[in-house]
Structures are given as C-alpha cells and as structure tokens.
C-alpha cells in the first residue's frame, strides 16, 4: 500500500515537472524524456479501476483515416505511383520492423527517434525509421548492384509531432531510388525531375526544390575550421536556417555546440547564400573553397546537374542553397528538399506552414555498411512527404466544400414496387459478374425515394430500376441521378450502356 502511495506521489510530481518544462519551453528532447518517464511510472502504477476511466483514442502521433481521407489518399498515391511507373520503377516491400542493429548508426542525431520494440524472444527489434535503410539492407542481403525501385509504406518516428501541420509518429513515405554505377548526375537529375513532376501533378501550389551537396558542406566546414567530430552536429544546426534566423543558428553553434564565434561567422558567410548555376560558378572561383578536393568535386557535379535539369526543363524550380544540410548521416553527395512556397490562397483558408514536402539525395556508402567486404552500391533517391500533402489537399477540399466520393459504385440496383428482392439480387449479381461496380439496399421492400436519396448522398451516378412491367417487357429503367432522365434499356444491353455512360472500357481485360 505504501508502495502504491509513493508511486502515486511520484506520478503527481513527475506530471508537475512535465508541465513546468512545457511552460518553460524546455528542449523537445528533455520534455520527451520526462514524458517517457511519467508514462513508465504510470505503467508501474497499473490500472486503478476506481479512478481511471479508459480514454478511447489512437496513440499520440497517429490517426485513423476516414473513407473521405482515404479517397484523398488514394488519389495522391495514384498520381505518385503512375509517375514512378512512368519512370520504369519496380516495386518492393520490406518488414515493418528490422533488427535494431540494421538501423543503428545510420541516422546520426535522429537515432533517438527510433522506436525500439520490447524483446520478442532474443532478437532486438526496431520499427523502421525510413524506407532507405531497409532498401540498402535489401540490396546488400540479395547482393543486388542495380535496381530502380519504388516503395510506399508506413514508417515510425518517436517525434513530438505537430499533427495539425501534417506531422505524425506513424506516417507513409513514398520512396523512389536508383541503385547502380552510372555516369555522374544522370540518375540524380531524373530523381529531381520525378519530384517536380509529382508536385506539379498534385496541384498543391508553387514549390521550390533546394539543392546542395554533402561534399560542399563538408568542404566548407573544413575550410571554415570545424573539426571532423563536429561536422554532423553543426550540419543539424545549419539545417534549421529555413525555420530560424542566422543569429539563432549561430547562438546554438557557439553556445550549445562549442564552436568558436569566428568559425561560425565564416560558416555564416557561405550558408546564407542561395541561387542557381551562377552561384555554383561563383563558388568554383572561391579561392578557399575551390582548394578543397571534396567541395570541388561537389561543385563540379552540381554544375553538371544543372545542365541536365535545364534539359529536363525544371531548372526554374531548383535553387542551390548552401544552408540545406539534411539531418541524416547517410547522405554522401547531392541532397535536395522540396518546399511549398505558399499553399493555394483559397477564400477564407489559413495559409499552411507545412514546409518540406519531398526530399532526397545521394547515399553511396549505405549499402557498403551492410556488406561484409564493404562493397559499395551507389544509390540516389527521393521521398515524397505524403502526409503533409494529404493535409494540404484535405484542407483545400474542405475550404472549397468539395464533395469527395468515397466509393466507386456506378449503379444502384433499385425496385419501384414490393416483392422484387429476388430480381434485384439476380440483376446485381449479373452486373458484378460483368465487372460493374454495383450496390443494392439491404431491405426487402425499400422505398424508391430512399433508394434515390442514397444515390445522391453516395454520389452514385446511375440507378437501374426494376418494376413488374419492366420485367414483363424484358427491359430495365436506367435513371441518371443528376439529370433525373430515365430510359428503358434492354436487359442484355444494360452492361454495355452502363459502361458507356460511366466511361469504363467495354472489356475487363
């Protein structure tokens, strides 16, 4: 009993601590840790039925998808998959959890966001954090040196997400990657082309793709006087420049990460620059940067990349941005990130600050990490941030009060009189067998008005009405729900007529 009282007191104290930290706007990591402690204390306390009412909800950072949301999602996926297939990609799938060892050491500072699973009989497992590391493991395991693949699946991150801005702990990623030894920058350019094609097709607003190169970053840090051990941590500070001012980034680098102020200032001179191919040319003339082998390689490749992007007709969408320093450890070359410049300004709609909607880069060393002999398979890829896109599309449709169909039913089989259930069942079965998407109401004697109303609500375009007279005449009354126009169609012609009216191919081959 004393044990329970002590635990209850600790839960109370820990709860107060968490609230205090939130009020003080303490670091996200500290709050996350203290919240995790609170949850562990509560778990030890166990349920006290007299006090605790179980709240029915999805776990933090997750959500259910309603039929309406799923309809949006499927449309978005359709655009993406069609583009991936147009570019000749195969599709793969991998397990939702991996051996913990597979994921360790691949994500740098982000490793703390990996979900570890409780021990399930000896294997230490973690939920996948992205689709790239599992892809690299797949290549190494199957000794593949050449593949162009896409993979659409859920990934998991122990983030503290702002769900209103399309950020979750469980979310979909849509990845496209090209693995293999090819001439420089051709696959990289295609990845950027794919990114632009998809974002343009989705019509979610104007966007810009920021491009940089890990080698330029590393070279720049080296000439500015950053020690090797600090490269990655300084990268993560620089990457915040799209969200906060240079002063704040500098303070973090100097105050929290121990960088000398003059080194930070030298970095600042570079990372605040962005432009096009002219900036690449300018930096190739930079007396210090051009002396650095890594940076020079990176700049040379970027120059070539811009040539290809011009040929692909997308150079106007690309900006060379020296502050882009994506937070994942595995990038080795070109890196890129697409951001929305603004969401469509619909009447009465709040502008959405959803930031990055796609990203990617070159990661030539990742497969080698899994190969016993360290054999490298060069890879480049991209990931579409579909959750953010879903949020934008959903909000836009809500603002437009647009009706979204959540089913694809083409026709409702209805009856105008009683005692025609058997006939309706026979007809709906004929339609299903012919590949028509059809429904009927699950009532013996539904009122015609109710059946028509159901079509209005569900957006079903056609009603096939059976009546006693129609049965005698061997016809079916086909009614258009929107125009209310009715025509008698011979029963043997019904399938063809429905297909004609709904634009479905006549053969389901």
């Amino acid at each position: 009993m004393a044990e329970r009282a002590a635990l209850e007191e600790l839960v109370k104290l820990q709860g107060e601590r968490v609230r205090g930290l939130k009020q003080q706007k303490a670091s996200a990591e500290l709050i996350e840790e203290e919240v995790a402690k609170l949850l562990k204390l509560k778990a030890q306390l166990g349920p006290d039925e007299s006090k605790q009412k179980f709240v029915l909800k999805t776990p933090k950072g997750t959500r259910d998808y309603s039929p309406r949301q799923m309809a949006v999602r499927e449309k978005v996926f359709d655009v993406i998959i069609r583009c991936f297939k147009r570019h000749g990609a195969e599709v793969i799938d991998t397990p939702v959890f991996e051996l913990k060892e597979t994921l360790m050491g691949k994500y740098g500072e982000d490793s703390k966001l990996i979900y570890d699973l409780k021990d399930q009989g000896g294997e230490l497992l973690s939920l996948r954090y992205d689709l790239t590391v599992p892809f690299a493991r797949y290549l190494a395991m199957n000794k593949l040196t050449n593949i162009k693949r896409y993979h659409i699946a859920k990934v998991y991150r122990r983030d503290n997400p702002a769900m209103t801005r399309g950020r979750y702990r469980e979310f979909y990623q849509c990845d496209f990657d090209i693995a293999g030894n090819f001439d420089p920058m051709i696959p990289d350019a295609e990845c950027l082309k794919i990114m632009c094609e998809i974002l343009s097709s989705l019509q979610i607003g104007d966007f810009l793709v920021k491009v940089n190169d890990r080698r330029i970053l590393d070279g720049m840090f080296a000439i500015c006087g950053v020690s090797d051990s600090k490269f990655r941590t300084i990268c993560s500070s620089v990457d915040k420049l799209d969200k906060v001012s240079w002063e704040e980034v500098k303070n973090e680098m100097v105050g929290e990460k121990g960088l000398a102020p003059e080194v930070a200032d030298r970095i600042g001179d570079y990372v605040q620059q962005h432009g096009g191919v002219s900036l690449v040319e300018q930096l190739l003339q930079d007396p210090k940067l051009s002396q650095n082998k890594q940076a020079l390689e990176g700049l040379g490749d970027l120059k070539l990349l811009f040539e290809y992007l011009t040929l692909f007709g997308i150079d106007d969408k690309i900006s060379f941005d020296l502050s882009l320093a994506r937070g994942l450890d595995y990038y080795t070359g070109v890196i890129y990130e697409a951001v929305l410049l603004q969401t469509p300004a619909q009447a009465g709609e709040e502008p959405l600050g959803v930031g990055s909607v796609a990203a990617g880069g070159r990661y030539d060393g990742l497969v080698g990490m899994f190969d016993p002999k360290g054999r490298k398979v060069p890879c480049v890829g991209l990931s579409i941030g579909v959750e953010r896109i879903f949020s934008i599309v959903e909000q836009r449709l809500e603002a437009l009060e647009e009706k979204i169909r959540t089913t694809e039913t083409q026709v409702l089989v209805a009856s105008a009189q009683k005692k025609l259930l058997e006939e309706r069942l026979k007809l709906v079965s004929e339609l299903w067998d012919a590949g028509i998407k059809a429904e009927l109401l699950y009532k013996k004697n539904p009122k015609l008005l109710n059946q028509l109303q159901y079509c209005e609500e569900a957006g079903i375009p056609l009603v096939a009405i059976i009546g006693e007279q129609e049965l005698k005449d061997g016809v079916i009354k086909l009614r258009s729900v929107t125009s209310r126009e009715e025509v008698d169609v011979r029963r043997e012609d019904l399938v063809e007529e429905i297909k004609r009216r709904t634009g479905q191919p006549l053969c389901i081959c």
Epitope: E9, L10, E33, A36, K40, L41, Q44, D119
Partner: antibody, heavy 120, light 107 residues
Framework: QVQLVESGGGLVKPGGSLRLSCAAS????????MSWIRQAPGKGLEWVSY????????KYTDSVRGRFTISRDNAKNSLYLQMNSLRAEDTAVYYC?????????????WGQGTLVTVSS | DIQMTQSPSSVSASVGDRVTITCRAS??????LAWFQQKPGKAPKLLIF???NLESGVPSRFSGSGSGTDFTLTISSLQPEDFATYYC?????????FGQGTKLEIK
Amino acid sequence: QVQLVESGGGLVKPGGSLRLSCAASGFTFSDYYMSWIRQAPGKGLEWVSYISDSSRYTKYTDSVRGRFTISRDNAKNSLYLQMNSLRAEDTAVYYCARYLYQVIAIAKSWGQGTLVTVSS
Amino acid sequence: DIQMTQSPSSVSASVGDRVTITCRASQGISSWLAWFQQKPGKAPKLLIFVASNLESGVPSRFSGSGSGTDFTLTISSLQPEDFATYYCQQAESFPYTFGQGTKLEIK
C-alpha cells in the same frame, strides 16, 4: 535479490583510458535507467552520468563530457563507462547504481564500487 | 547547477538522542530530494526518497520532511548502527547533486 558488480578499475596514467563494467542481476535490467556515481577519496558523492533503459537518453556531468561514454547492453545485463583522457581529478571509487522505480534519479541499489586511480 | 548545502558538517550525539540534519537547495526542487547513509568503505544506502518517503527496510526512527528549498532528516532515537555519514541529493534536474555530507559521530 538485486546485485550490481563493478569491474575494470585500476591504476592508469593521466591521458590514459579505462573501461568500467557493471554486471547486473536480480531484476529486469532493460526496464531501468542506470547511472555511474563516483566518490573521490575522503570526499563527497558526484553523479557522473546516466543512461536510459533503451539507451535513447544519456547525460554527463560537465567535468567528464566529451571524455567519458556511458553505454549498456541489455542482452548481457551490463552497463559500461568508457573513460578516455583521464585526469588526476578522476581518481575515485566508481559506483554503478540503479534508479528508483525505473526512472527516478535516486540511486536505490548500488554496487560495491571499483577504484580508479589516475597517477603518473 | 543546483547546489546542495548540508548542516551541520558534523555532529556528535549519544545513543537515544534525537538528531536533525538539514539540507538546503540553491533553488526550489519541489520534493525531489533523497537522503543516504554511508559507512566507511561501503556504498551509500538509500533511506528517504521524495523528501518524506521511507525506503522499505529502513527503520521508522528515520523520517524526512520539507519541500522547495529546505529539508530535514530526523533520527528520533539514535542507535549504535546509525553512526555514519549522511548525504542529501536533489533529483530535480541534471546534474543531480549531493550535499557535502554530515558526519554523525559518537559523543
């Protein structure tokens, strides 16, 4: 019953390295935050570092940050402290300690300690 | 960092005496305080946690009180095995800090 047994201490020259280990038994090691606490000869106690149950979180006192690394292997029920660039002021008995109620930063169970002497 | 100051640094008392040791934090720590007992050549032993909760197996003559910045450990009737050094420790924020210790000696 809960047992924590430290090992790996000894005499080392300034600038040298040592790796301390702590073997845990008698409880579900992977459920608990663990820590290293030290006590210089004839002096008070100093909390050196801690590590969370899953190794997600680690912290170090200022005087050892960048030189010491705490780690754990839940499969082996073991806690470690890698000590590099050792200084004379690191001389102390190092205790491995288990948190109270898994996550409360109060040392409920302690090992017997292992002596680290840094001297030229 | 939060500083913990214990007083007195040493105290002489006899078996059967009532002894009070105080601990002051340099800033408020709510009830995040523990008391430990340490005997020469041994590891410390937890007595009290979150200011006033007696650790299981610890005799009831030990008690703790206080919150915020001022805390006390009281031994109601000293026993021969109680002569040792006592430390307070704050568990409010890292680095978790201990008081300098109070040595309880036989008069």
